[in-house]
């Protein structure tokens, strides 16, 4: 038998060489297109296991899009035809709650999750006899990657997990299904940086295959929370990085989400974008914002993919995406997942399992309406899945998809066998569909979230709500004391109230100057390298938030450290959530906050508000009866008509949909 090369096994403390054999065909080679279903017998630790695999229909689309750039930097859009892909999910026969994510492209490669252990399998290099190596994921050497929590804390957490008998996976899964009965769909966009692309030999196909494999692994991990991962886009920075990746992880994350908001959202709708980087950040495996999955400005994360396997990397991306989905670190909380460590442990443990805490954190996000964008089943032209009637995703050529025949019995609008609408139905799903009919134009489908938001209405001829828009960044709010920024009025008092309760308000400026000049975890202007940055006096209002009149101590699923600083007859209150170095600190002043006359906070600096590019003269453009929205169109006040709020009418904008029902004048205001 061939012996594995040093490179292939140097990261393993133990492994076996096995030869899987296929049950469903006499010969090993599968003619293309790949089979929809296939079974293998594999050996692990002296036992034979029968594994049953089914192509992951929900993973990739008919119009799978890959963005790359040519030498001149021009964007190239490619639709590679990968309908009959080779990425599978499945289970191990006779092993309760087992799950598998495997590719069968060039041999078997992937992850097998059994009840008490996870295994990796990959083809043995240079073998001509279909030999593979199989190993426990626990036996993979991993660089100790930090998430801002000391090793002592991690050891203590691990020791505690070993002492206690964790509940079985069955119990956890049963509980989670009760907590999260409705399937959520994360429309994921992956961006691969230039260095990672170079590392893959500048082979776009290899990068694409690896990222599809990654998405399949993510799907296999998230399915236990009733969350499906749908890969809606891949961009490879083939010609050079489109953001500055110099600096700390926080700087790069900030640059990435700004780029995403400016360039990516407009090109391809998605819920979260994850940047895959080769460059490391001194042991930090990644970084992401918490609870921002549906945010236009912050739904993103960065993930370091250096000298590790894609199987190990999958748990890093699962972790950072978990942050976007509202999940905090498990450390210091009473969490269990049926394994020594869980995905949201801060130590980047390579775990495949989400903990009970992660399920609760995600449930909190959904209860607080932070996950509304996850309810839509991706549209046919957005979902990267090989079309398949019955996968609950509306693929190209389908009008609806109610799932299995049993599920379709409960759907009054959709014909399950054909994935077409029933003869009397106009629609089967969507915010503007009710009882198989389009809701009338003028039905409110997305209310305002703040004074800087505008409502959207059904248009009467579509099942979908109009796209979400808000008041243009830079519009004054809070009686000219603040500016609108990404649909929120950003001002200190409101931020203090979110953290310290409804009576809290901003501390005096002296507090900000005194505390933020220290450059420690309780007072700083961000992080540079391995240390906190002191705030210059002019930037002090953009560092750690300082509040007074505090009557409530915050609890956000994680207990923060609170500091009180006496200053000129008042107490300044600040907070450190200790979320770890891979999570931006919610105790900092929010971006877009007005820090002086005509100035706002950006990247912990107080800069000229002109960076917001607000260019709307509401008196001229909207005749004093409206505001400009984020598409730079007038949204008219009730009583005035779009597009320019010049004549009498019923409010709204060219983007909002009609604000009243044209067929029913009784509804007119």
């Amino acid at each position: 038998a061939a012996r594995p090369g040093f490179q292939q096994t140097s990261h393993l403390s133990s492994y076996e060489i096995i030869t899987p054999w296929r049950l469903t065909r006499e010969r090993r080679e599968a003619p293309r297109p790949y089979s929809k279903q296939v079974s293998y017998v594999i050996q692990a630790e002296g036992k034979e296991h029968i594994i049953h695999l089914e192509r992951n229909k929900d993973l990739l689309p008919e119009d799978f899009v890959v963005y790359t750039y040519n030498k001149e930097g021009t964007l190239i859009t490619d639709h590679p035809n990968i309908q009959n892909h080779c990425h599978y999910r499945g289970y191990v026969e006779g092993v309760h709650n087992s799950s598998i994510a495997l590719s069968d492209c060039f041999g078997l490669r992937g992850l097998l999750h059994l009840e008490n252990a996870s295994y990796g399998i990959e083809p043995l290099q240079n073998s001509s006899h279909f030999e593979h190596i199989i190993y426990r994921m626990d036996d993979v050497y991993k660089e100790p990657l930090k998430c801002g929590v000391s090793n002592k804390d991690i050891e203590k957490e691990t020791a505690k997990d070993e002492e206690e008998e964790p509940p079985s996976m069955t119990q956890l899964l049963r509980r989670r299904r009760a907590v999260l009965p409705q399937t959520r769909y994360v429309e994921l966009f992956i961006v691969v940086d230039k260095e990672r692309y170079d590392m893959m030999g500048r082979n776009q196909t290899a990068v694409r295959e690896e990222m599809i494999l990654l998405a399949n692994y993510l799907d296999s991990m998230y399915i236990m929370l009733n969350i499906r991962i749908v890969l809606v886009g891949l961009e490879i920075w083939t010609n050079g990085n489109l953001i500055n990746i110099v600096g700390g992880a926080g700087d790069v994350l900030g640059n990435f989400v700004q780029w995403r908001e400016k360039f990516l959202i407009t090109r391809r709708r998605h819920d979260s974008a994850q940047l895959v980087l080769k460059k490391g950040f001194g042991g930090t495996a990644g970084m992401a914002f918490v609870g921002t999955v549906c945010s236009r400005s912050h739904a993103g994360g960065i993930n370091v993919f250096g000298q590790i396997t894609v199987e190990t990397f999958a748990s890093i991306v699962a972790h950072e995406l978990g942050h976007n989905l509202g999940m905090n670190h498990d450390d210091g909380r009473d969490c269990s997942c049926g394994a020594k460590s869980c995905i949201m442990n801060s130590g980047a443990s390579g775990s495949r399992n989400f903990s009970s805490c992660s399920a609760e954190d995600f449930e909190k996000l959904t209860l607080n309406k932070g996950g509304n964008c996850l309810l839509n089943i991706p549209k046919p032209d957005e979902a990267y899945s090989a079309p398949s009637c019955g996968n609950k995703l509306v693929d190209a050529g389908e009008e609806c998809d109610c799932g299995t025949p049993k599920e379709c019995e409960l759907d009054p609008c959709c014909e399950g066998s054909t994935c077409k609408l029933k003869s009397f139905a106009e629609c089967a799903y969507g915010d503007c569909c009710k009882d198989c009919r389009f809701l009338p134009g003028g039905t409110l489908c997305r209310g305002k979230t703040s004074e800087c938001d505008v409502p959207e209405y059904c248009n009467g001829s579509s099942q979908f709500c109009q796209p979400d828009v808000f008041i243009q960044n830079g519009y004054p709010c809070q009686n000219n004391k603040a500016y609108c920024y990404n649909g929120m009025c950003q001002y200190y008092d409101a931020q203090c109230q979110v953290i310290f309760g409804s009576k809290a308000k901003a501390a005096p400026k002296d507090c900000f100057i005194e505390v933020n000049s220290k450059g420690d975890r309780f007072g700083n202007c961000g992080f540079s390298g391995n240390e906190y940055k002191k705030c210059a006096t002019g930037n002090a209002l953009c560092g750690k938030l300082q509040c007074e009149n505090v009557q409530e101590i915050p609890v956000f699923g994680i207990v923060p450290a609170i500091i009180q600083t006496p200053s000129r007859g008042t107490k300044c209150w600040g907070v450190d959530f200790q979320l770890g170095s891979d999570v931006p600190d919610p105790g900092m002043v929010n971006e877009g906050t007005k820090c002086g006359a005509g100035k706002i906070c950006r990247n912990f600096q107080c800069v000229d508000a002109s960076v917001l590019n607000y260019d709307c003269d509401v008196q001229k453009k909207c005749h004093g009866h409206g505001v400009c929205n984020s598409n730079k169109n007038c949204h008219c006040e009730n009583g005035w008509a779009p597009p320019n709020c010049e004549t009498k009418g019923y409010g709204g904008s060219v983007d909002s949909g009609p604000t009243y029902n044209e067929m029913n004048t009784a509804l007119r205001d």
Partner: nanobody
Framework: EVQLVESGGGLVQPGGSLRLSCAGS????????MGWFRQAPGKEREFVAA????????YYEDSVKGRFTISRDNAKNTVYLQMNSLKPEDTAVYYC???????????????????WGQGTQVTVSS
């Protein structure tokens, strides 16, 4: 900028009546749909009634239909809530509210409204 001030609250016996007023200032008041909301101790704020800016349409929360009437006098920049057959469960702080963009039919579902009064207490008790 619109300012709203409520008045007319007080203590009343079950079955009794009260009339709340909401006086508005600001040039745009007469073009705003207006609503009444209430918040009982330990409960979320809830929609009660709304009236369109031309006073042609009104909307009510189910539990107050037939008992409460919303009206407005644009010449006086005032909105009223006439409450009859009051019940103990109507006890709450009553707020008058409005928004530049909200139509009356959507007032209860809008999620966030621009203008709020400070509230007036209504207590129904024997």
């Amino acid at each position: 900028e619109v300012q709203l001030v409520e008045s007319g609250g007080g203590l009343v016996q079950p079955g009794g009546s009260l009339r709340l007023s909401c006086a508005g200032s600001g040039r745009t008041f007469s073009r705003l749909a207006m609503g009444w909301f209430r918040q009982a101790p330990g409960k979320e704020r809830e929609f009660v009634a709304a009236i369109s800016w031309l006073a042609e349409t009104t909307y009510y929360e189910d539990s107050v239909k037939g008992r409460f009437t919303i009206s407005r006098d644009n010449a006086k920049n005032t909105v009223y809530l006439q409450m009859n057959s009051l019940k103990p469960e109507d006890t709450a702080v009553y707020y008058c509210a409005s928004d530049r963009f909200a139509t009356a039919q959507h007032m209860g579902a809008m999620g966030s409204l621009d203008y709020w009064g400070q509230g007036t207490q209504v207590t129904v008790s024997s």
